[in-house]
């Protein structure tokens, strides 16, 4: 587009991933300048004509928006001036996923940076004692992941002990057929350790962990982002 | 304050084809975040959208309409407009027209709507 | 497309009680959900979007829950004003569509 101001101002973004059926955001941030509406935004995507999104003169412009985006993309409008850029996306979609760019101009100068967004499905896993089981058993699920992740459990008590031989793993496609509910089923416990169930794929990383006492049961999950 | 304002023939004969135009006052249908869309409702019943369009022509339509939907825009003279072809007494409804976000895509405000009857 | 399924059809309540209103959608919808509400021979009025952000003009008698594929719509003390019929339309995927409605009568 066409640029004004001889100067290169500083864009920053950060590569980061989207969970397919979700909102997710595309970060970037520039120097700040209160002239508000001598600032324009253009959100591009490599191999797509048209643009993700256009923000100039204080509003929106989407006459020049690709089909693929129609109704699915707003920047922070209050925050554009404070220098973020960031762009939201509804419902993510698998093929959303590409290297996108952030085009700043404004009175300072203009810059752009690019941008790796990832798309995949990633959940919290949930650990439950399986009574059914004719021996004390520990079922993991975890509702929606994509790609396939692998799935591995390990103990408090047993550490570096290898639990494939003594677990089950499925994977079940949900009506969408794209992502899958993992489901993980550890036999053999024993009451007084915490077990830990893994799922992982190239985009994230889950944890769910069970206490099993005489007592009570204790949970707790984590989901840390890969690579972002 | 924006207001929008339906009209168009209350009486379309079966297989005709219906014309409504919403008239925008009050702003303009320039205004970059908003779509500007369609929505029926037939007597008695819920709701159904039809479809919006971009001040700039980009439209999209509800795919169980979509082959005898078309809106359109005039900018000139801050209107927007639905034609629904090849009609028949299940097109009889209140059809309103209403600004929608790009994003989130709320419908607001809406027209006061306009009854179109089907029928010979 | 995303059928949105609304319960009760009918809700019978006396001024100055609570309405609980749900709305179901058969898939996902993240927090891309709004609630109107429609008095007979009126437009609908926008009252509640992003699942649970008030629209302008709206009293904090109503508020909006929930997300993923349920949500509810609060009326904390009705008013004579609020008896009406509400619907809720998910905005998530193209076609947009709506619930078949909760009608909020005096009892």
């Known amino acids: 587009f066409g640029i004004s101001g001889k100067h290169f101002i500083t864009v920053t973004t950060f590569t980061s991933a989207g969970n397919i059926g979700e909102d997710g955001t595309l970060s970037c941030t520039f120097e700040p300048d209160i002239k508000l509406n001598g600032i324009v935004i253009q959100w591009l995507k490599e191999g797509i004509k048209g643009l993700v999104h256009e923000f100039k003169e204080g509003k929106d412009d989407l006459s020049q928006q690709h089909e693929m985006f129609r109704g699915r993309t707003a920047v922070f409008a209050d925050q554009v001036v404070v220098g973020n850029a960031s762009l939201r996306l509804k419902n993510v979609q698998l093929t959303d996923a590409g290297t996108y760019t952030c085009y700043i101009r404004t009175s300072k100068g203009k810059g752009n940076a690019n941008l790796e967004y990832k798309t995949g499905a990633f959940s919290m896993p949930e650990i439950n004692v399986d009574y059914n089981a004719s021996s004390e058993s520990l079922r993991c699920e975890a509702p929606r992941w994509f790609p396939q992740p692998t799935v591995a459990w390990a103990s408090q008590v047993d550490q570096g002990a290898n639990f494939s031989e003594v677990s089950n793993t499925s994977f079940e496609l949900n009506s969408e057929n794209v992502t899958m509910k993992v489901v993980s089923v550890l036999y053999n416990v024993t009451i007084n350790n915490t077990y830990s169930c893994m799922i992982e794929n190239d985009i994230a990383k889950a944890t769910g962990d069970i206490k099993v006492t005489d007592s009570e049961v204790k949970r707790r999950s984590q989901l840390q982002l890969l690579n972002s | 304050q924006l207001q929008l304002q339906e009209s168009g023939p209350g009486l379309v004969k079966p297989s005709e084809t219906l014309s409504l135009t919403c008239t925008v006052s009050?702003?303009?249908?320039?205004?970059?975040?908003?779509?500007w869309g369609w929505i029926r409702q037939p007597p008695g019943k819920g709701l159904e959208w039809i479809g919006n369009?971009?001040?700039?022509?980009?439209?999209y339509y509800n795919p169980s309409l979509k082959s005898r939907v078309t809106i359109s825009v005039d900018t000139s003279k801050n209107q927007f407009s639905l034609k629904l072809s090849s009609v028949t007494a299940a097109d009889t409804a209140v059809y309103y027209c209403?600004?929608?976000?790009?994003?989130?895509?709320?419908?607001?405000?809406w027209g006061q709507g306009t009854l179109v009857t089907v029928s010979s | 497309e995303i059928v949105m399924t609304q319960s009760p059809a009918t809700l019978s309540v006396s001024p100055g009680e609570r309405a609980t209103l749900s709305c179901r959608a058969s898939q996902s919808v993240s927090s891309n959900l709004a609630w109107y509400q429609q008095k007979p021979g009126q437009a609908p009025r926008l009252l509640i979007y992003g699942a649970s952000t008030r629209a302008t003009g709206i009293p904090a008698r109503f508020s909006g829950s929930g997300s993923g594929t349920e949500f509810t719509l609060t009326i904390s003390s009705l008013q004579s004003e609020d008896f009406a019929v509400y619907y809720c339309?998910?905005?998530?995927?193209?076609?947009?569509?709506f619930g078949g409605g909760t009608k909020v009568e005096i009892k």
């Open positions: 209403a600004r929608e976000g790009s994003y989130p895509n709320w419908l607001d405000p």
């Open positions: 369009i971009y001040y700039s022509g980009s439209t």
């Open positions: 009050g702003g303009s249908i320039k205004s970059g975040s908003h779509y």
């Open positions: 339309q998910q905005y998530h995927s193209f076609p947009f569509t």
